[in-house]
């Protein structure tokens, strides 16, 4: 049960995280105009990865796409790439993890296959989360650098009467969405990797496997073949600990290749 819960929770957390990464990538507010020097501006600027927008006090909002590819800063292109790679890996990870979920049975899929798929999706989620966090962090670093550069420019050469206030940009909502979403995807991936360990059948062969059934005498059969209790075969020789204390996962019978759902 613990493994199923960990896997399911990992999937849900990753799903929320990837949805957040997609949302952050599409959002226009990656950087917003810093209002420290002019808190009552009638024109508010904000920028995203794909377009820049201006919201006027009149209520009119105008957005313009970055229709050039070569003219854009290399850092912006890198951030775009990181976010897209994060989304693609996350989407593939989600697809893989759906089939890897313990609660979903597809034909004759072995537990080892599910374990491998869980691990694969977990790694994909981790990389996806790291890509998102890296992308957002690179953009944030770019903002901080530009902010201090424009601040330096703002306070130099102001001997004249006319002030030309340079627009400075600060962190937008998308950055925080991206950081949180990347973190969630990363956590979801780690949970999937942890679940994979619980799913993977142990290779140690035991001479005997005990089956307990109420109202029947306990039958022992070496090799773990079908016993008189009527339980399904346990060809994987699942380790059953002595002492009788077991989790639900440890008691669960596993379907053979002849079982269909």
């Amino acid at each position: 049960m613990a493994v199923t819960a960990c896997q399911g929770l990992g999937f849900v957390v990753s799903l929320i995280g990837i949805a957040g990464i997609i949302a952050a990538t599409c959002m226009d507010q990656w950087s917003t105009q810093d209002l420290y020097n002019n808190p009552v501006t009638a024109v508010f600027n904000y920028q995203g990865l794909w377009r820049s927008c201006v919201r006027e006090s009149s209520g009119f909002t105008e957005c313009r796409g970055y229709f050039t590819l070569l003219g854009l800063p290399a850092m912006l292109q890198a951030v775009r790439a990181l976010m897209i790679v994060g989304i693609v890996l996350g989407a593939i990870g989600l697809l893989v993890s759906i089939f890897a979920l313990k609660c979903i049975r597809i034909g004759s899929m072995e537990d080892s296959a599910k374990a491998n798929m869980t691990l694969t999706s977990g790694i994909m989620f981790i990389v996806s989360g790291l890509c998102a966090i890296a992308g957002v962090s690179v953009f944030a670093n770019m903002l901080v650098t530009n902010f201090w550069m424009s601040t330096a420019n703002m306070y130099t050469g102001m001997g004249g009467m006319v002030q030309t206030v340079q627009t400075r940009y600060t962190f937008g909502a998308a950055l925080f969405v991206g950081w949180v979403a990347g973190g969630l995807t990363l956590i979801g991936g780690v949970m999937m990797c942890i679940a994979c360990r619980g799913l993977a059948p142990e290779e140690t062969n035991y001479k005997a496997v005990s089956y307990h059934a109420s109202g029947h005498s306990v039958a022992y059969k070496p090799g773990g073949f079908k016993a008189s209790t009527g339980f399904g075969s346990n060809t994987k020789n699942k380790k059953i600990y002595d002492g009788g204390a077991r989790t639900e996962d440890e008691v669960q019978s596993y379907p053979s290749k002849h079982d269909y759902v």
């Epitope: 009638a42 024109v43 201006v54 006027e56 009149s58 209520g59 006319v162 030309t164 627009t167």
Partner: antibody, heavy 120, light 113 residues
Framework: EVMLVESGGDLVKPGGSLKLSCAAS????????MSWVRQTPEKRLEWVAT????????YYLDSVKGRFTISRDNAKNTLFLQMNSLRSEDTALYYC?????????????WGQGTSVTVSS | DIVMTQSPSFLSVSAGEKVTMSCKSS????????????LAWYQQKPGQPPKLLIY???TRDSGVPDRFTGSGSGTDFTLTISNVQAEDLAIYFC?????????FGAGTKLELK
């Protein structure tokens, strides 16, 4: 046709109060940012206050901050300006104005104005 | 606050002439986000409320004759009226539409010679 009709202007003593109203018609009132602009007897134009569309954010001229309150009733298509602690320098013709949606924050429509005189 | 300075205060012209008036702002009215200038020009005839002529420093409002031309960027702006007509005699105001308070210039009064 866009119409802005101001009312409520009067002769009032210093320290007194007055509430101006502006009845709007001919357009979807709730979709526009509205302002009050006054014109002094010397013909100088002075922006007084603005209430934004959507957010309902309000902005005021420093000299009227804390004394004047701009508000709107979208259901009744009406703009208000509550003026308290009136001073002689508030004497002016008060215009109800609409900021154009695509006019770069410029006022595209003005009312005919309502006169406020603050005198003892 | 952004201070708007208009010059000259008075302009005497004859019908058919070309006239130019200036408006200077204490801060730039140019917005880098959309590469636009936030300055408007209004015309006020006696006994009437002001009427929008130009917005965005150079865009004529609908119904405004093409003899009215707005130009300039940043802090220096100009309104030009080519072939002045008798109906153009009025006071012309410029306005900062970039930052609150949305300040106006003192106006330029156009008179007949």
């Amino acid at each position: 046709e866009v119409m802005l009709v101001e009312s409520g202007g009067d002769l009032v003593k210093p320290g007194g109060s007055l509430k101006l109203s502006c009845a709007a018609s001919g357009f979807t009132f709730s979709r526009y940012t509205m302002s009050w602009v006054r014109q002094t007897p010397e013909k100088r134009l002075e922006w007084v206050a603005t209430v934004s569309v959507g957010s309902g954010n309000t902005y005021y001229l420093d000299s009227v901050k804390g004394r004047f309150t701009i508000s709107r009733d979208n259901a009744k298509n009406t703009l208000f300006l509550q003026m308290n602690s009136l001073r002689s320098e508030d004497t002016a013709l008060y215009y109800c104005t609409r900021l154009g949606q695509t006019q770069r924050n410029a006022v595209d429509y003005w009312g005919q104005g309502t006169s406020v005189t603050v005198s003892s | 606050d952004i201070v708007m300075t208009q010059s000259p205060s008075f302009l005497s012209v004859s019908a058919g002439e070309k006239v130019t008036m200036s408006c200077k702002s204490s801060q730039s009215l140019f917005n880098g986000g959309n590469q636009k200038n936030y300055l408007a020009w209004y015309q006020q005839k006696p006994g009437q409320p002001p009427k929008l002529l130009i917005y965005g420093a150079s865009t004529r409002d609908s119904g405004v004759p093409d003899r009215f031309t707005g130009s300039g960027s940043g802090t220096d702006f100009t309104l030009t009226i080519s072939n002045v007509q008798a109906e153009d005699l009025a006071i012309y105001f410029c306005q900062n539409d970039h930052s609150f308070p949305l300040t106006f210039g003192a106006g330029t009064k156009l008179e007949l010679k």
